[in-house]
């Protein structure tokens, strides 16, 4: 055996954003023939020796970072990329608005603003159909998400969440959807 065993993949189905009391399944997938898996919840000292963790009803205590590995012979694989399992609906939903408005001409500018009555310092913006939130450092975790030089690809349904950096895996309920329409 030369070099470390390749890392497995870890995914949350149907999504890593899980409303409280809703089900989610974490699945660790390594190469064919591997059956010894360890799934860890980081910063909690806990682990289980199974590739699949079924959570029938999401709880606050289950939110956090997860990672998995597998053992082949006496060798351990590299760890999977960390999966951030987020509990949503912990706090009331924020409001999402578009400035100057939700209808914008192609080539124009628009800013999506996420507002909450709580003193949260973190915000995430999701576009329906995208696998992940906007993670561009300039737009990530901000109350304002400017979209410069709008194109047709920006059309769609947006939602935002708010949360605190002290509890980064406990999020609000999603805002009501905002439909961004790109004309021309």
């Amino acid at each position: 055996q030369s070099g470390p065993l390749p890392k497995p993949s870890l995914q949350a189905l149907p999504s890593s954003l899980v409303p409280l009391e809703k089900p989610v399944t974490l699945r660790c997938q390594g190469p064919p023939g591997v059956d010894l898996y360890r799934l860890e919840k980081l910063s909690s000292s806990r682990y289980q020796d199974q590739a699949v963790l079924f959570i029938p009803a999401m709880k606050r205590s289950l939110a956090g970072r997860y990672r998995c590995s597998y053992q082949n012979g006496s060798l351990w694989s590299l760890p999977s990329d960390q999966l951030e399992l987020v509990a949503t609906g912990v706090f009331a939903k924020p409001s999402l608005s578009a400035q100057p408005g939700p209808a914008v001409s192609s080539g124009g500018d628009v800013t999506l603003q996420c507002q909450t009555r709580y003193g949260f310092d973190q915000f995430a913006l999701y576009k329906e159909g995208d696998p992940a939130p906007y993670k561009n450092p300039e737009r990530w975790y901000r109350a304002s998400f400017p979209i410069i030089t709008v194109t047709a690809a920006h059309s769609g349904t947006y939602r935002c969440y708010s949360f605190s950096s002290r509890d980064p895996y406990l999020w609000s309920a999603p805002s009501d959807p905002l439909e961004l329409v790109v004309t021309g």
Epitope: L36, R38, E40, K41, L42, S43, S44, S45, R46, Y47, Q48, D49, L53, R65, R67, S69, Q71, S74, W76, P79, Q82
Partner: antibody, heavy 123, light 112 residues
């Protein structure tokens, strides 16, 4: 109450073998990871080996890999450590320790320890 | 050479506060693994003192507290008592080969 009792220690010559046992009682043995941890005279603690609750996951410290073999018999509530090719530096008190468990989760710490059994490797 | 680094000894007078540090690396404490502390009184087996960085098992006085930050952790003992004289060990897990790791131990001496 939880009890872990080690046995099998003694004096052995370098290159010799010894088998340690740990008898567990007062808890559901088959639910818990178990480990062997040793302490050389006047020195600190060194983790030696661990075995998963079903005996599948097995890990060793680099210092004993290939010489020591951990095993368990859940029907007998017993943990074992077969030590071969013993060296002077293996001289230590060997502790059997239980890993904490809660519901489906195992934890990376030891909530109960036995009193230990002394292994002396000397010619 | 232990994977986790602790001072060999600390001391304090009765009633005082002492702290014991435990320094690891990005593959253990810094990799998201918690730190646990054990107390070993002279001639006895180690006993779990703090688990999950800062939690006390039942029966452990609240004079003992733990914390973790980045790749290090510390154990604090306030209102030092003669019976606290013991060896203290930190422990974590290491991601490299999934091994359990200990600090070298710290001998606490209660003066006077």
């Amino acid at each position: 109450q939880v009890q872990l009792v080690e046995s099998g220690g003694g004096l052995v010559k370098p290159g010799g073998s010894l088998r340690l046992s740990c008898a567990a009682s007062g808890f559901s043995f088959s639910d818990h990871y178990m480990s062997w941890i040793r302490q050389a005279p006047g020195k600190g603690l060194e983790w030696v080996s661990s075995v998963g609750s079903e005996g599948k996951f097995i890990d060793y410290a680099a210092s004993v890999k290939g010489r020591f073999t951990i095993s368990r018999d859940n029907a007998k509530n017993s943990l074992y450590l077969q030590m071969n090719s013993l060296r002077a530096e293996d001289t230590a008190v060997y502790y059997c320790a239980r890993h904490y468990r809660e519901f489906r989760w195992h934890y990376y710490y030891f909530d109960y320890w036995g009193q230990g059994t002394l292994v002396t490797v000397s010619s | 050479q232990s994977v986790l680094t602790q001072p060999p000894s600390v001391s304090g007078a009765p009633g005082q506060r002492v702290t014991i540090s435990c320094t690891g690396s990005s593959s253990n404490i810094g990799a998201g693994y918690d730190v646990h502390w054990y107390q070993q009184l002279p001639g006895t087996a180690p006993k779990l003192l703090i688990y999950g960085n800062s939690n006390r098992p039942s029966g452990v006085p609240d004079r003992f507290s733990g914390s973790k930050s980045g790749t290090s952790a510390s154990l604090a003992i306030t209102g030092l008592q003669a019976e606290d004289e013991a060896d203290y060990y930190c422990q974590s897990h290491d991601l490299g080969a999934h091994v359990w790791v200990f600090g070298g131990g710290t001998k606490l001496t209660v003066l006077g």
